[in-house]
Interface confidence: low
Amino acid sequence: VPPGEDSKDVAAPHRQPLTSSERIDKQIRYILDGISALRKETCNKSNMCESSKEALAENNLNLPKMAEKDGCFQSGFNEETCLVKIITGLLEFEVYLEYLQNRFESSEEQARAVQMSTKVLIQFLQKKAKNLDAITTPDPTTNASLLTKLQAQNQWLQDMTTHLILRSFKEFLQSSLRALRQM
């Protein structure tokens, strides 16, 4: 049972997870809903959402992004390449979602749900993917040092990082959702 969840509340034992496209679609929309709540708290707490210095901070974060070569856009769509990109991207986001865990006061529950729901989404997608060999898993040591580095930033940078992670994760999921609907 994931930390912070009651055993009765994770998939409520009797409700079997479905791995159909519809289920994946719903899982993503559920996560996006959680992100929406987290973004509300972030934007209410600081002025990061209107900040013009975003680009500078963004360069220091290696947040996953969809590019033309990933095959997820309508032009040059490639199901296998795209699926690999989505899974790889989500795996890369996991360290950033871990970072978000102590970043919220009133939305602590939501932050945990977003993190755990993403883990489940990855599992769903891995079942769907045929070419699992092409999926590179982030190095745990690298992730651990990245997490330490992010947590050592000053308050302003931490707020900025939180905002950027949420914004990028939302965009990545929205792109993933559009692509998965074509599969």
């Epitope: 969840e5 409520a12 479905l18 289920r23 899982q27 559920y30 809903d33 929406s36 529950e109």
Partner: antibody, heavy 123, light 104 residues
């Protein structure tokens, strides 16, 4: 165990207002979508309104749109239904139900229902 | 809006019979359909979700099938305790909608 307890029903005149509450316990309320369903005397079930878990996004049946407002207080584990401009056709038992949610978003289906609260609109 | 047409509106059957209730959606709803049982004077109870998944504690004589626009609830070997009204619900897109019910 999971429990949903509705309250706030009663007799009200046409054009009047009522606020229904649903106290939830036994599960992580904030992680679930919640829904109100009603049943008029001797009639079938009618979906009334649903609310998303986190963002609070909402949806309504055409028959209540503009008159009813669904809301939730995740800190109090409570779901609400504010009913304004009530009509005689709103007379029904109102059920609070748990919709999809948890960490693994499974197939929908209202797996838990409250006992219902009676709303009667009559002059 | 999606309209759910449930048939028949009522049916009589004998104990041990195989009973079939159908729900037709006005447009494709994939497998986003659940079935509920409501016994007289009681609250509704979830039987089937995801068109064919049996809810915990529901006897195996109940089964659901279908996808797209056509769905079926089957009770194989009717028992006295199955006397109830049965409803389907599409939860594919808002506004969600119930079928009109089948009184057994």
């Amino acid at each position: 165990q999971v429990q949903l307890v509705e309250s706030g029903g009663g007799l009200v005149q046409p054009g009047g207002s009522l606020r229904l509450s649903c106290a939830a316990s036994g599960f992580t309320f904030s992680n679930y979508y919640m829904t109100w369903v009603r049943q008029a005397p001797g009639k079938g079930l009618e979906w009334v309104s649903s609310i998303y878990s986190f963002s609070g996004d909402t949806a309504y049946a055409d028959s209540v749109k503009g008159r009813f407002t669904i809301s939730r207080d995740n800190a109090k584990n409570t779901l609400y239904l504010q009913m304004n401009k009530l009509k005689s056709e709103d007379t029904a038992v109102y059920y609070c139900t748990r919709d999809l949610g948890g960490v693994v978003v499974t197939a929908n289906g209202y797996d838990y229902w409250g006992q219902g609260t009676q709303v009667t609109v009559s002059s | 809006d999606i309209v759910m047409t449930q048939t028949p509106s009522s049916l009589s059957a004998s104990l041990g019979d195989r009973v079939t209730i159908t729900c037709q959606a006005s447009q494709s709803i994939s497998t986003e359909l659940s079935w509920y049982q409501q016994k007289p004077g009681q609250t509704p109870k979830l039987l089937i979700y995801g068109a064919s998944r049996l809810q915990t504690g529901v006897p195996a004589r109940f089964s659901g099938s279908g996808s797209g626009t056509s769905f079926t609830l089957t009770i194989s070997g009717l028992e006295a305790e199955d006397l109830a009204t049965y409803y389907c619900l599409q939860d594919y897109s808002w506004p969600y909608s119930f079928g009109s019910g089948t009184r057994l």
